[in-house]
């Protein structure tokens, strides 16, 4: 249950990021989400989430951006690899994590 | 203290045109969207216009859309609402608002009455 | 273009509990704002994220969002919180800021 509130509360701070597109959107961010087919639920919050706090050096965090941070780390593994070569911009980074939260939540 | 304050207001006839400005102070403009609102005479909100914190991309309201042009100079931390082709139905208090996610700051508002 | 109905005008006894709905289809999914308007005055943003409130807003005022209806709530209602209140949302496909038609709220007594 809590899972699902959380990811619905996730979902929400991402339609409406995605609904901007201010400076902070065409940050350089690492695709994480070139993972393979079998990483774990926990890893992926857990890449996405180091993203995020790596936005906190661009003076680009504002209150949707913490509150996903915060989200994502409380369901995620404590440490993760991030070895990815492949870029993206924030934006879409956020839209490409919004179409796996809202493919969990309608499975759960 | 943050402070919006609008100018521009007028009396203009049908086909008419106006540029109204807003004058920013206490907060960083350059690093926010901002929009625009109106009000007209005993009716509710409705929003017209934004343009994002660098400029360049907007958006606007079906109802204004190709008459109306919003812009920003952060230089003078203004932001301004070129309206062009009035009508009668854009009679209204303009407001500018800062959107912080959230329009959490106002302007007091001028008022553009179009009439013949 | 998402449509928020708000009902014109809610009355509510001078110290009671005042409800002001805001229904638009799945307006869970989405964030609601409300603002307060008096007479010959800018709107005030009053609650944020369905249910934050900005610092200088009294408890008093509180907000919920759940499926279709968004719902602003004064407790305790005061002469002073007799004001117009308007919902708003973030319309994600037009792109746009949303109003709801707003409320005027009378407190009696």
């Known amino acids: 249950h809590n899972f699902n509130i959380t990811i619905k509360e996730i979902i929400k701070m991402l339609n409406i990021l995605t609904a901007r597109n201010d400076s902070c959107m065409e940050l350089t961010v690492k695709d994480v989400f070139t993972a393979p087919k079998n990483t774990s639920d926990k890893e992926i919050f857990c890449r996405a989430a180091t993203v995020l706090r790596q936005i906190y050096t661009h003076n680009c965090s504002n209150r949707y951006l913490r509150g996903l941070y915060r989200n994502l780390s409380s369901m995620a593994n404590k440490t993760c690899s991030m070895n990815e070569i492949k870029k993206s911009t924030l934006k879409d980074f956020l839209e490409r994590l919004k179409v796996i939260m809202q493919k969990k939540y309608y499975r759960h | 203290e943050v402070q919006l304050v609008e100018t521009g207001g007028d009396l203009v006839e049908p086909g008419g045109s106006l540029r109204l400005s807003c004058v920013a102070s206490g907060f960083t403009f350059s690093g926010y969207y901002m929009s625009w609102i109106r009000q007209a005479p005993g009716k509710g909100l409705q929003w017209v216009a934004d343009i994002r914190d660098s400029g360049g991309n907007t958006h606007y309201a079906d109802a204004v859309r190709g008459r109306f042009t919003i812009s920003r100079d952060n230089a003078k931390n203004t932001l301004y609402l070129q309206m062009d082709s009035l009508r009668a139905e854009d009679t209204a208090v303009y407001y500018c608002?800062?959107?912080?996610?959230?329009?959490?700051?106002w302007g007091q508002g001028t008022l553009v009455t179009v009439s013949s | 273009q998402s449509v928020l109905n708000q009902p014109p005008s809610v009355s509510v006894n001078l110290g009671k509990t005042a409800s002001i709905t805001c229904e638009g289809d799945?307006?869970?999914?989405?964030?609601a704002f409300w603002y307060q308007q008096k007479p010959g005055q800018a709107p005030v943003l009053i609650i944020y994220?369905?249910?934050k409130r900005p610092s200088g807003i009294p408890e008093r005022l509180s907000g919920s969002n759940s499926v279709n209806t968004a719902t602003l709530t004064i407790s305790g209602a005061r002469a002073e919180d007799e004001a117009d209140y308007y919902c708003?949302?973030?319309?994600?496909?037009?792109?746009?800021?949303?109003f709801g038609g707003g409320t005027h709220l009378t407190v009696l007594g």
């Open positions: 608002a800062r959107d912080d996610w959230g329009l959490d700051y």
């Open positions: 994220d369905d249910s």
């Open positions: 708003q949302v973030w319309d994600n496909s037009a792109k746009a800021i949303v």
């Open positions: 799945n307006i869970g999914d989405k964030y």
